[in-house]
């Protein structure tokens, strides 16, 4: 499907056009590009308002949009293989026309990481709500749609066209119609600013009668930053109306002569420009010569001016523009310095927090302090980091190595520790014997017991012996039948899991007493070290920094 220009808004040095039509982001960008533009940027709140205005104009004319929610492509995209960067306002997305990473953003919801496919951003419009300047369209990211399959595409898109400058709309001093044709092939009869290289056709007359005259003008550059049509005096003037029609087309004052003719004039402090319609201030600061937040200060007698910058900024070589002073060059911070517009801020590496003597100082965060330890059991604080450890019978577990998981000694790498039945418990295990056998004093072997149908003998139940505190792993006991006493076949496990209160002859003993000599030690502490300061500047010089690190934000750490 094609796309029709339905609306246009020109402001500053740019025009925004809104189009309806189910196109992929690539097709939409191509459409904008054919006329010399790009999918629109939304680099500031002001620009978001301009885009909202053009969308509002489109929606007033567009009857077909019946959906409650509507989406329009803008020029914000993230290429395949480029990952989300939650620290940036644009989250790793970039503007299609190029340009810097801008501070403004208006995301609809938290973004999910996905580096495997190209992602594109659209403006999400809730059509059930009126479009208000205070409620700007939200940014929604998703797949970029596919050419030729309208079902996968969204409702429309917004283009942006940038220009050297703009001409003011032509002033009509009597009845008539102006039609502007822009370089991006849009025609309009009402633009608040008309882009450079546009044409204006003026047809004078009441409309019902024959038009008495017509004019043709082009918006051109006449001098630095002076864009004008080259028309002199108001157009379509009529003695019948004099100054009564649109103030004679004059910018400020309109003076009538006795014969129905009239002239434009200006108030004190202003002068009439070459077009004999527009007034400009005589004050040299009125043309806003200072840029970048600089204030224009009038010189003596109102003749000259100088530009003055706010604190944290300085004048550049042109003496007209303010540029940020990079306070970080003086190394005012102990660890990280972030230069900000007009100032700076100190930041601490991960694992450190602001504090200590001096401005911008950092001190180690004691991750193991009471109430904040991330570890399930043992926690050791280190400078800028920490590491977790586990008590006997547990090993470090979990994605981040902060949890402790019970070691199942009954299926351990050294083979079964019990001669017959083995019961795993939290942090320990017990050995047991089949009916007719009793546990030997060593707690591991089984010996033939007296034939009895009464309750089996054995040491008292020591279920909780060796149980560690602080474990987050749920308590469970499992029985694993192992080999029987020498010369007897292996026992077959029973279908009902023995519980510690069952009639099975069981016992428990502290782990250290149960480890048979020569068997591998059960006490293991891999001590995963948390390199939480990995984002700080501690990469070894010349080292390979391509290793992906797991970030706390759930991303895979690839930059």
């Amino acid at each position: 499907t094609g796309a029709d220009t339905e609306a246009v808004v020109c402001v500053g040095t740019a025009c925004y056009t809104a189009h309806s039509g189910k196109l992929s982001a690539a097709e939409a960008q191509n459409h904008c590009n054919q006329n010399g533009g790009n999918l629109a940027t939304v680099k500031s709140k002001e620009e978001a308002q301009h885009v909202q205005r053009v969308l509002a104009q489109l929606l007033r004319r567009e009857a077909a949009l019946t959906a409650r929610m509507s989406k329009f492509w803008i020029g914000l995209q993230r290429e395949k293989g480029k990952c989300l960067d939650p620290s940036l306002p644009l989250k790793g997305f970039s503007w299609v026309g190029g340009g810097e990473d801008t501070p403004y953003s208006n995301w609809h919801k938290e973004l999910r990481n996905s580096c495997i496919s190209k992602r594109c951003v659209s403006l999400l419009l809730d059509l059930s709500q009126p479009l208000l300047p205070s409620r700007l369209p939200k940014w929604s990211e998703g797949p970029c749609g596919s050419p030729g399959s309208p079902g996968s595409n969204i409702e429309g898109f917004v283009c942006k066209f940038s220009f050297k400058g703009m001409c003011r709309p032509l002033a009509l001093g009597g009845p008539g119609q102006v039609t502007y044709t822009t370089p991006f092939q849009t025609t309009s009869s009402s633009l608040e600013a008309v882009p450079f290289a546009s044409a204006a056709n003026v047809a004078c007359g009441e409309g019902d009668k024959d038009e008495t005259q017509s004019h043709y003008f082009l918006c051109k550059e006449k001098a630095p930053d002076v864009f004008d049509w080259g028309s002199s005096g108001p157009l379509c003037v009529s003695p019948k109306y004099g100054c009564n029609f649109n103030n004679g087309g004059c910018h400020q004052d309109c003076f009538e002569g006795g014969d129905g003719s009239f002239l434009c004039g200006c108030r004190p402090g202003f002068r009439l420009l070459d077009d004999l319609v527009t007034c400009a201030s005589r004050n040299p600061c009125s043309s806003s010569p200072c840029r970048g937040g600089a204030t224009c200060v009038l010189g003596p007698h109102g003749k000259n001016y100088t530009c003055r910058c706010p604190q944290g900024y300085q004048l550049d070589s042109s003496q007209l523009d303010c540029v940020d002073v990079d306070e970080c060059q003086d190394s005012p911070c102990a660890q990280e310095c972030v230069n900000t517009p007009g100032g700076f801020r100190c930041e601490c590496w991960v694992g450190y927090e602001p504090g200590g003597p001096g401005e911008g100082a950092c001190q180690d965060v004691d991750e193991c302090a009471l109430g904040r330890s991330p570890c399930a059991q043992g926690c050791t604080n280190t400078d800028g980091s920490f590491h977790c450890s586990c008590e006997e019978g547990y090993v470090l577990a979990g994605e981040d190595g902060t949890q402790c998981q019970d070691v199942d000694e009954c299926v351990g790498p050294g083979g079964p520790l019990c001669d017959s039945l083995c019961f795993n418990t939290q942090g320990s295990f017990h050995c047991g014997c089949l009916p007719g056998w009793v546990l030997a004093p060593n707690g591991v072997s089984c010996t033939m017991g007296p034939v009895s149908l009464g309750p089996p003998s054995g040491p008292p139940d020591e279920e909780d012996k060796g149980e560690k505190e602080g474990s987050t792993v749920p308590r469970a006991a499992t029985a694993s039948p192992t080999r029987g006493p020498e010369g007897t076949p292996k026992a077959t496990p029973t279908t009902s899991r023995p519980s510690l209160s069952s009639d099975a002859p069981i016992t428990s003993a502290p782990l250290k007493m149960l480890a048979p000599s020569g068997s591998p030690g059960v006490w293991r502490e891999p001590s995963i070290h948390h390199a939480t300061a990995a984002s700080g500047p501690q990469e070894p010089a010349g080292g390979d920094s391509s290793v992906a690190t797991q970030n706390n934000d759930g991303t895979d750490g690839q930059k």
Epitope: F217, L218, K220, P224, G230, L320
Partner: antibody, heavy 121, light 112 residues
Framework: QVQLQQSGPELVKPGASVKISCKGS????????MNWVKQRPGKGLEWIGR????????DYDGKFKGKATLTADKSSNTAYMQLSSLTSEDSAVYFC??????????????WGQGTLVTVSA | DIVMTQAAFSNPVTLGTSASISCSST???????????LYWYLQRPGQSPQLLIY???NLASGVPDRFSGSGSGTDFTLRISRVEAEDVGVYYC?????????FGSGTKLEIK
């Protein structure tokens, strides 16, 4: 390539008028300012004024208003300058010069070869 | 109107050495956009003027990089790093900040 071809030399009597031409080729004639510059023998350059052929918009240096009239014919891609009430002060070489980019006012990278106007009784 | 001032003659230069030509304006040609609207043209004997430098320091198309322009808002210099015989002629500075556009009186490059 861009070319500006000016009309040949003119010998005119004082008080008369003369109209010299500058034909543009190799570009979109309507969308570029055409400037006119005067150079008296052994002297410097003076900007007379300019015309935008697309809509006939003109600008003049105040001292040439009433002396020079600039016009353009889009159909023949030709710009004209008429000089009236000629005196010996008007004896000079007159150059046409086109701007560098469409719709822009500066600079003048393309010049005609010049037309010598001699005012003599 | 803005008046552009130039010396009538340069200091005589030897071929292969550098030369500098100066120009000054009665008003700063630095616009609020940061652009300085100062231009240099060379008129060789019997020829039309040729654009050398535009907007104070930009080299025009086809001009050898021996030519360079610099300056402040009101004082400007055209520098030729290695003068060649074909560089002989009159050098004009011009301003296009305000209408009427005005030219300097021209500086003739003298060869020793």
């Amino acid at each position: 390539q861009v070319q500006l071809q000016q009309s040949g030399p003119e010998l005119v009597k004082p008080g008369a008028s003369v109209k010299i031409s500058c034909k543009g080729s190799g570009y979109a004639f309507s969308t570029y300012w055409m400037n006119w510059v005067k150079q008296r023998p052994g002297k410097g350059l003076e900007w007379i004024g300019r015309i935008f052929p697309g809509d006939g918009d003109t600008d003049y240096d105040g001292k040439f208003k009433g002396k020079a009239t600039l016009t353009a014919d889009k159909s023949s891609n030709t710009a004209y300058m008429q000089l009236s009430s000629l005196t010996s002060e008007d004896s000079a070489v007159y150059f046409c010069a086109r701007t560098g980019a469409a719709y822009e006012f500066d600079p003048f990278p393309y010049w005609g070869q010049g037309t010598l106007v001699t005012v003599s009784a | 109107d803005i008046v552009m001032t130039q010396a009538a003659f340069s200091n005589p230069v030897t071929l292969g050495t550098s030369a500098s030509i100066s120009c000054s304006s009665t008003k700063s040609l630095l616009h609020s956009s940061g652009i300085t609207y100062l231009y240099w043209y060379l008129q060789r004997p019997g020829q039309s003027p040729q654009l050398l430098i535009y907007r104070m320091s930009n080299l025009a198309s086809g001009v050898p990089d021996r030519f360079s322009g610099s300056g402040s808002g009101t004082d400007f210099t055209l520098r030729i790093s290695r003068v060649e015989a074909e560089d002989v002629g009159v050098y004009y500075c011009a301003q296009m900040l305000e209408r009427p556009f005005t030219f300097g009186s021209g500086t003739k490059l003298e060869i020793k």
